[in-house]
Interface confidence: medium
């Protein structure tokens, strides 16, 4: 048997708690909040849980809340891309899925969410404080990444809220420009929220999912929970990492493009340039655009295998390969 704890999600107060009128007056703020969070800045949510039956078994679920089409999803562990993370799986919507030990099963749950089952023993076994990261490359938003982990004290069978580990990028004018259109709405939202500050605040409560709901949806936090704002990322150092991560190539199985530590000298020097900021509290969700090149034309290393499934006139290249989807 497996117990599951849902990610805490901000929910509007129920009519019975506040009255029908109070609920109606908060509709606009919540709509605006959702717009402010999702329209201009796509989000990535990550959820990690440990199986009750196997202490070394993890399930990672990730989803992308954005309007663009997903071109690639990379799941890594040991830290975010560019901070020593190692690729566990790469999923391409058309070209297939590649996974590497100790990943056991990677699959698409919906068009915008994936799941990955990890199990291992010994050096390649994950443990409770391992950080798992998901990076979604989408068009036109770019690449967005978020990380999550189980705290060391987590009971088996419980899922943990995402542990944010964003990597903010410079040169976001295009994306931020879209977000700017919503600036007035967001300001108005804050104004409305301030006006309603005398009312009971929305409660943090588990997301409720009907048994008939799609599995992926059950794992996706409500969009309102995306209110945690983007913050620059301070490198996470997990005490539990696969032994093979000490090398430049994580070969529990065939793999490609294992990420290596970023050279500080090549971190982008922009408004979002790698500032060290405390990681937000549990229950927050973050994602970061890091798919655009920095102004200097440099990009920190990121995890994610190479892929190729394009038809090739030179011969019958296979769909998948040990160094990446082919």
């Amino acid at each position: 048997m497996r117990t599951e704890a849902q990610v805490p999600a901000l929910q509007p107060p129920e009519p019975g708690l506040e009255g029908a009128m109070g609920h109606r007056t908060l509709v606009l703020p919540w709509v605006l909040l959702t717009l402010c969070v999702t329209a201009g800045t796509p989000e990535v949510w990550v959820q990690v849980r440990m199986e009750a039956t196997e202490l070394s078994s993890f399930t990672i679920r990730c989803g992308f809340l954005g309007s663009g089409s997903i071109s690639l999803v990379t799941v890594s562990w040991g830290g975010p891309n560019g901070a020593g993370g190692t690729t566990l799986a790469v999923l391409h919507p058309e070209r297939g899925i590649r996974q590497w030990a100790p990943a056991r099963q990677a699959r698409w749950e919906t068009q915008s969410s994936i799941s990955l089952i990890l199990e291992g023993s010994g050096a390649s076994s994950p443990c409770a404080n391992t950080t798992f990261c998901c990076k979604f490359a989408s068009f036109p938003e770019g690449s967005w990444e978020a990380c999550g982990s189980l705290p060391p004290s987590s009971d088996p069978g419980l899922s943990a809220p995402p542990t944010p580990a964003p990597i903010l990028r410079a040169d976001l004018a295009g994306i931020l420009g879209v977000s700017g259109v919503l600036l007035f709405g967001c300001v108005y939202l804050l104004h409305l929220l301030r006006r309603h500050k005398h009312r009971p605040a929305p409660r943090l409560q588990p997301s409720r999912t009907s048994p008939q709901a799609p599995r992926a949806r059950a794992w996706a936090p409500s969009q309102a929970s995306q209110a945690a704002l983007h913050v620059p990322y301070a490198t996470i150092n997990t005490s539990c990492r696969p032994a093979t991560l000490d090398t430049a190539h994580p070969h529990g199985g065939p793999s490609w493009w294992a990420s290596l530590p970023t050279h500080a000298a090549h971190r982008p020097q922009g408004p979002a340039a790698w500032a060290s900021t405390p990681i937000p509290a549990r229950g927050s969700f973050v994602s970061v655009e890091n798919g655009l090149y920095a102004q200097a034309g440099e990009r920190p290393p990121h995890t994610g295998p190479g892929l190729t499934l394009f038809p090739d006139p030179r011969g019958p290249r296979a769909m998948e390969g040990p160094l990446g989807v082919r």
Epitope: A248, W257, G306, R326
Partner: antibody, heavy 120, light 113 residues
Framework: QVQLVQSGAEVRRPGSSVRVSCKPS????????FTWVRQAPGQGLEWMGG????????NRAQNLQDRLTITADESTTTVHMDLTSLRSEDTAVYYC?????????????WGQGTLVTVSS | DIVMTQTPLSLPVIPGEPASISCRSS????????????LDWYLQKPGQSPQLLIY???HRASGVPDRFSGSGSGTDFTLKISRVEAEDVGVYYC?????????FGGGTKVEIK
């Protein structure tokens, strides 16, 4: 066939740095993997590392990871290889190779090579 | 790391005659998930950059004459030239891309007798 044009020969002192650039003459820049391979005089081929610009992914040989930086400049569709703390044993011809569409191990197209001489 | 060992180191050939180069890997390059063997062959002609000849064990790259063929399985591989021509001289390298780091064989120098 797409040509990979590399920057010219370099002479460097030990302890200094060098940058070698690689620019494809045509084709799509972002969807290919670019790999750097070097060849010391009279020796065989040694894989150094590579980058896949579309996913911003990089890998490097373990013995070079502290000195090697590989970057891609989308605006100029140029891949750069920076090697720091040069030693005499870094004297070699440095090749840029490109793999077919997201490929990683297939070195389909090669640059003409750049000779880097490290000498005091 | 996967170690690639090529033999012979040098191969004198007679134009029109067949030639064969062997390559051995320290571990299997066969990937059961897709049935492919991740071994490539490259030729570096004198004074030139390497060029891809054979990829994934047996597939000829674009423009490569059909006198070149690759075969083998697991850890033992062979590049064959059915009829050597003068333009085939150079150093032949096998390379594995089963896993990182990518590794090359030491090379086999083919020269006309």
């Amino acid at each position: 066939q797409v040509q990979l044009v590399q920057s010219g020969a370099e002479v460097r002192r030990p302890g200094s740095s060098v940058r070698v650039s690689c620019k494809p003459s045509g084709g799509t820049f972002g969807t290919y993997a670019f790999t750097w391979v070097r060849q010391a005089p009279g020796q065989g081929l040694e894989w150094m590392g590579g980058i896949t610009p579309i996913s911003a992914t990089i890998n490097r040989a373990q013995n070079l990871q502290d000195r090697l930086t590989i970057t891609a400049d989308e605006s100029t569709t140029t891949v750069h290889m920076d090697l720091t703390s040069l030693r005499s044993e870094d004297t070699a011809v440095y090749y840029c190779a490109r793999g077919f569409e997201y490929s990683d191990g297939l070195l389909d197209d090669w640059g003409q090579g750049t000779l880097v001489t490290v000498s005091s | 790391d996967i170690v690639m060992t090529q033999t012979p180191l040098s191969l004198p050939v007679i134009p029109g005659e067949p030639a064969s180069i062997s390559c051995r890997s320290s571990q299997s390059l066969f990937y059961s998930d897709d049935g492919n063997t991740y071994l490539d062959w490259y030729l570096q002609k004198p004074g030139q950059s390497p060029q891809l000849l054979i990829y994934r064990l047996s597939h000829r790259a674009s423009g490569v004459p059909d006198r070149f063929s690759g075969s083998g399985s697991g850890t033992d591989f062979t590049l064959k030239i059915s009829r050597v021509e003068a333009e085939d001289v150079g150093v032949y390298y096998c390379m594995q891309h089963m896993e990182f780091p990518l590794t090359f064989g030491g090379g086999t120098k083919v020269e006309i007798k």
